[in-house]
């Protein structure tokens, strides 16, 4: 007679899981399971994660919170977002630095170190793409500079210096013999 009824909650479903005697509802994000429920389909006793720990998942049955990661100072990392009860520390690079992945197949959780961004201005070049996820992409030489080899050379200030063809095109000087 008792077996003809449907179960009170789905123990294998998304919201309940058999913990100990009963199917218990999970804990919200930022909380850990202190004690399982004491009745069928009941609420577990859930407590807030202690400082420096977190749990990001909703409706979980974890009995302890995960330790917040510390950003790697040796790799010049900084905390972009501090750890909270519901989210881990988000490590990244400070302004003027970019992420250099330490593995070839780079994903968000891959180990990385921070590299200083190229200063296009110091190289006398235009900044084509600002440095953030990758190094700065520098463009052509700034006005008053011309391409010479790998770098930008300042236009001569007098007619006494030599001014090759590229120089003449950029600097407005005719080639001097």
């Amino acid at each position: 007679q008792g077996g003809t009824r449907s179960p009170r909650c789905d123990c294998a479903g998304d919201f309940h899981k058999k913990i100990g005697l009963f199917c218990c509802r999970g804990c919200p994000a930022g909380h850990y399971l202190k004690a399982p429920c004491t009745e069928p389909c009941g609420n577990s006793t859930c407590l807030v994660c202690p400082q420096d720990t977190f749990l990001a998942w909703e409706n979980h049955h974890n009995s302890e919170c995960a330790r917040c990661q510390a950003c790697d100072e040796q790799a010049s990392q900084v905390a972009l977002e501090n750890c909270s009860a519901v989210a881990d520390t988000r490590c990244g690079c400070k302004p003027g630095w970019f992420v250099e992945c330490q593995v070839s197949q780079c994903v968000s959780s891959s180990p990385f170190y921070c590299q200083p961004c190229l200063d296009c201005g110091a190289l006398h070049r235009h900044t084509r793409l600002l440095c953030s996820r990758r190094d700065t992409d520098c463009g052509t030489c700034l006005p008053g500079f011309y391409e010479h080899g790998d770098g930008c050379v300042s236009c001569p200030t007098s007619t006494l210096g030599s001014c090759p063809e590229r120089c003449a095109a950029v600097c407005g000087w005719r080639q001097m013999f």
């Epitope: 009824r5 179960p7 009170r8 913990i19 005697l21 009963f22 199917c23 009745e39």
Partner: antibody
């Protein structure tokens, strides 16, 4: 045939400790939650402790919580009740019981041992 | 905690007559169609024995003269016709939530 045999009952002074054992046979012990229930000299039945099957979780009423510890040894088919800081009101016959349940999550004590007597007195 | 109140505390019935035992809970022990109330029989010198589970389900091997009914807070155990071997104390117990509790028992005697 399901059998539950308790042992370890004794006369003990208030504040003392005692460990009860229950030897189970005739069924797949590890697949069942198990309990201890006691019956006072006034014939009152009281639930004392339960241990679940699987990852063992333990449950106690407030009047024994922190003083009694239920445990199990699935390899030996044994159930235990460690009792400490005993009081005169813990005097009773202690029964080992098997908990039957199904997916509907009701529990009922379908088999009981013969009991072991615990007397707490100075 | 849910308190179970049994009445009467003792009962004297003639052989072949009906014995009716009541168990009242301080809070509903029923939910989603389930009545988490069970009945046990304890004969002198023996441990309790499960008679009826979930208010009305007869445990295997228990004679059909035993029956249970009720829901919510009011439950009844009926024995009809009463036989000599039914002399015992009868207890109700709930498993709706922890802590599980028992009634104080009803002692059945034959007139």
């Amino acid at each position: 045939e399901v059998q539950l045999v308790e042992s370890g009952g004794d006369l003990v002074k208030p504040g003392g400790s005692l460990k009860l054992s229950c030897a189970a046979s005739g069924f797949s012990f590890s697949a069942y939650a198990m309990s201890w229930v006691r019956q006072t000299p006034e014939k009152i039945l009281e639930w004392v402790a339960t241990i679940s099957d699987g990852d063992p979780y333990t449950y106690y009423p407030d009047n024994v919580k922190g003083r009694f510890t239920i445990s199990r040894d699935n390899a030996r088919n044994n159930l235990y009740l460690q009792m400490s800081h005993l009081r005169s009101e813990d005097t009773a016959i202690y029964y080992c019981t098997r908990e039957r349940n199904d997916y509907d999550q009701y529990y009922t004590m379908d088999y009981w041992g013969q009991g072991t007597s615990v007397t707490v007195s100075s | 905690d849910i308190v179970l109140t049994q009445s009467p505390a003792s009962l004297v019935v003639s052989l072949g007559q009906r014995a009716t035992i009541s168990c009242r809970a301080s809070k509903s022990v029923s939910t989603s169609g389930y009545n988490y109330l069970h009945w046990y029989q304890q004969t002198p010198g023996q441990p309790p024995k499960l008679l009826i589970y979930l208010a009305s389900n007869l445990e295997s091997g228990v004679p059909a003269r035993f029956s249970g009914s009720g829901s919510g807070t009011d439950f009844t155990l009926n024995i009809h016709p009463v036989e000599e071997e039914d002399v015992a104390t009868y207890y109700c117990q709930h498993s709706r939530e922890l802590p599980w509790t028992f009634g104080r028992g009803t002692k059945l005697e034959i007139k």
